[in-house]
């Protein structure tokens, strides 16, 4: 999906008012310095591409993030503010249902959510120069 035509300010507002705290709660008990940010993004569409990938695509050691509350809210926000997003995701979701895993918080998942927090912070500050 091409995130170029999303309403970025509305997604930023959604993040600040409905998603950010759920990411913090997921990470509770973890030191903010525990994980290095290894995933970066260069602009808002790129950030959303990376956010979507880390949130919804199962990875080795962390297959369960898509069923977390922050993921549900991310999915809802993208569906509302990114034209055509919901249509492109229907088939993907049907496929995911077949391989649904139970929720387990692993160290790999914590690392992945730490990366997500970094991507969202970058999304919210699009005018900053890339480090």
């Amino acid at each position: 999906y091409d995130f170029t035509n999303c309403d970025f300010e509305k997604i930023k507002a959604a993040y600040l008012s409905t998603i950010s705290k759920d990411l913090i709660t997921y990470m509770s008990g973890t030191k903010s310095t525990e994980f290095n940010n290894t995933v970066s993004c260069s602009n808002r569409p790129h950030c959303l591409t990376e956010i979507q990938s880390l949130t919804f695509n199962p990875t080795a050691g962390c297959a369960s993030l898509a069923k977390e509350m922050f993921a549900m809210k991310t999915k809802a926000a993208l569906a509302i503010w990114c034209p055509g997003y919901s249509e492109t995701q229907i088939n993907a979701t049907q496929a995911m249902k077949k391989r649904r895993k139970r929720k387990v918080t692993t160290n790999k998942c914590l690392e992945q959510v730490s990366q997500l927090q970094g991507l969202w912070r970058r999304f919210n500050r699009p005018l900053l120069k890339q480090q």
């Epitope: 959604a14 600040l16 008012s17 409905t18 998603i19 705290k21 759920d22 913090i24 709660t25 509770s28 069923k67 509350m69 549900m72 809210k73 999915k75 809802a76 926000a77 569906a79 509302i80 997003y85 919901s86 249509e87 995701q89 229907i90 979701t93 049907q94 249902k97």
Partner: antibody
Framework: QVQLVESGGGLVQPGGSLRLSCAAS????????MSWVRQAPGKGLEWVSG???????YYADSVKGRFTISRDNSKNTLYLQMNSLRAEDTAVYYC???????????WGQGTLVTVSS | DIELTQPPSVSVAPGQTARISCGGD??????VYWYQQKPGQAPVLVIY???KRPSGIPERFSGSNSGNTATLTISGTQAEDEADYYC??????????FGGGTKLTVL
């Protein structure tokens, strides 16, 4: 303007079935998480069920296995199929647009379901 | 999973400040929303994201949330604020949960 209109409520006997409908207008229905919330006479609000644009569904424990939520995005309509109804299911049922999977920003006017013999 | 506890009733004199609490285990780690419901009407969202006001909601409505308690504050309460108020949050099982409701009486 943004509007939700419920229909299908009425009197039904215990053990019976009823299907509620909710017609949505004024917004892109297919993009939103939609829910049913009920309120028994003189009581508080109780979330019943919700569904995403992709058909994934969520239920309160009190109705799991008896109620089925569904949607027809082409008709901008939300449904609640209620089976094996009990007296305690008597309530006003509200159709609701649940913004970002969390708070309800738009409510219908409600439809009364009475389960009684 | 989380249960939300509200006082059944709160009374306040006109012009005074009304505070309605909503308690729940580690509630501060979740977002809380508040609804106002007048007799015979559907609820209306008055606070979302703990403390944000939807457009059209008067500034006298404010919210906070930390620890195990969220609070809806109505400053300079008016007669028209008399209503039932419900807090709402969500569970780890991805379901929505409401508090039992508080009847606000303006004396």
């Amino acid at each position: 303007q943004v509007q939700l209109v419920e229909s299908g409520g009425g009197l039904v006997q215990p053990g019976g079935s009823l299907r509620l409908s909710c017609a949505a207008s004024g917004f892109t229905f297919s993009s939103y998480y939609m829910s049913w919330v009920r309120q028994a006479p003189g009581k508080g609000l109780e979330w019943v069920s919700g569904t995403f644009f992709d058909g994934s569904t969520y239920y309160a424990d009190s109705v799991k296995g008896r109620f089925t939520i569904s949607r027809d995005n082409s008709k901008n309509t939300l449904y609640l199929q209620m089976n094996s109804l009990r007296a305690e299911d008597t309530a006003v049922y509200y159709c609701a647009r649940q913004q970002y999977f969390d708070h309800i920003d738009i409510w219908g006017q409600g439809t009364l379901v009475t389960v009684s013999s | 999973d989380i249960e939300l506890t509200q006082p059944p009733s709160v009374s306040v004199a006109p012009g005074q400040t009304a505070r309605i609490s909503c308690g729940g285990d580690s509630l501060g780690g979740k977002y809380v929303y508040w609804y106002q419901q007048k007799p015979g009407q559907a609820p209306v969202l008055v606070i979302y994201g703990d403390s944000k006001r939807p457009s059209g909601i008067p500034e006298r409505f404010s919210g906070s949330n930390s620890g195990n308690t969220a609070t809806l504050t109505i400053s300079g309460t008016q007669a028209e604020d008399e209503a039932d108020y419900y807090c709402q949050s969500y569970t780890n099982a991805l379901s929505t949960v409401f508090g039992g409701g508080t009847k606000l009486t303006v004396l």
